[in-house]
């Protein structure tokens, strides 16, 4: 059963390592894949002394942990590298960190990347 599923056909693309990887630095990435597989967008970033440094953004292969996520939100507490994935065109344009712990109150830090 699949409820209210949003198709992902393209994602915001960014690669901080673009020169070494010989890719574009930024743009829109069309998401390809088998027709029976779902596609997602993702973002990875670091928080260096309070400054957000985007590592990569783009398309992400079919991954059940990305299903039904309309927003790109990292919820893991204090990760080394932040990661989120989502479904829907360009859903990785905005990403946020919203740590959810069992006892403490979560705080929201939305991020709008400006590569």
């Amino acid at each position: 059963a699949i409820l209210g599923r949003s198709e992902t056909q393209e994602c915001l693309f960014f690669n901080a390592n673009w020169e070494k990887d010989r890719t574009n630095q930024t743009g829109v990435e069309p998401c390809y894949g088998d027709k029976d597989k779902r596609r997602h967008c993702f973002a990875t970033w670091k928080n260096i002394s309070g400054s957000i440094e985007i590592v990569k953004q783009g398309c992400w292969l079919d991954d059940i942990n990305c299903y039904d996520r309309t927003d790109c939100v990292e919820k893991k507490d204090s990760p080394e590298v932040y990661f989120c994935c989502c479904e829907g065109n360009m859903c990785n344009e905005k990403f946020s960190y919203f740590p959810e712990m069992e006892v403490t109150q979560p705080t929201s830090n939305p991020v709008t990347p400006k590569p």
Partner: antibody
């Protein structure tokens, strides 16, 4: 520490029903897809069912479709497997597993035994 | 119906190297199937060894490594030890929510 604790197993007659529960702690339950995996006595592991973070998408192996229903209560940090019309071949240890990015099972419960016999 | 195949059994000498493989009937295994590997000893829950083809799970010794060999996923154990004697399962993620387990390989460490 991540903990998954299954309960609800037991002896049931063919055609009967059981509801398994998996109580999760030590991680943000509502941020993880979850699965049920079973193992018949002396046999290998078999994926049974998975559910997305919201519960909006559910998936089953062919042999349990229409008989088993997976669900979750994110406010109670609990995963469920409702098993109806049970058959002898459903006899197995049922494991609850947390699913992480790259769709792999990163944590497992200790399992609960379901025996279907008359 | 997708069938994932593993060697039913394998033997290795202590200190030796063994490579277990995981293929399927519908074509080649690639990284897009996120191959993962699990170890299980009798009466115990499975333990996660490798995910995303070649990433070791936390606490797993570097004697265990994952790869793609030809058209199959592979788990290599170097410097095999007595307590590596276990059942090993691979899992392929077929997409659209579906996971498929291999039949498992029973690994015997000789001696």
């Amino acid at each position: 520490e991540v903990q998954l604790l299954e309960s609800g197993g037991g002896l049931v007659q063919p055609g009967g029903s059981l509801r398994l529960s998996c109580a999760a702690s030590g991680f943000t339950f509502r941020n993880s897809a979850m699965s049920w995996v079973r193992q018949a006595p002396g046999k290998g592991l078999e994926w049974v069912s998975s559910i997305s973070v919201t519960g909006g998408s559910t998936y089953y192996t062919d042999s349990v479709k229409g008989r088993f229903t997976v669900s979750r209560d994110n406010s109670r940090n609990t995963l469920y497997l409702q098993m109806n019309s049970l058959r002898a071949e459903d006899t197995a240890v049922y494991y609850c597993a947390k699913v992480y990015y790259y769709s792999f099972f990163d944590y497992w419960g200790q399992g609960t035994l379901v025996t279907v016999s008359s | 119906q997708t069938v994932v195949t593993q060697e039913p059994s394998f033997s290795v000498s202590p200190g030796g190297t063994v490579t277990l493989t995981c293929g399927f009937n519908s074509g080649s295994v690639s990284t897009s199937y996120y191959p993962s590997w699990y170890q299980q000893t009798p009466g115990q829950a499975p333990r996660t060894l490798i995910y995303n083809t070649n990433t070791r799970s936390s606490g797993v010794p570097d004697r265990f490594s994952g790869s793609i060999l030809g058209n199959k996923a592979a788990l290599t154990i170097t410097g095999a030890q007595a307590d590596d004697e276990s059942d090993y399962y691979c899992v392929l993620y077929m997409g659209s929510g579906i996971h498929v387990f291999g039949g498992g390989t029973k690994l015997t460490v000789l001696g």
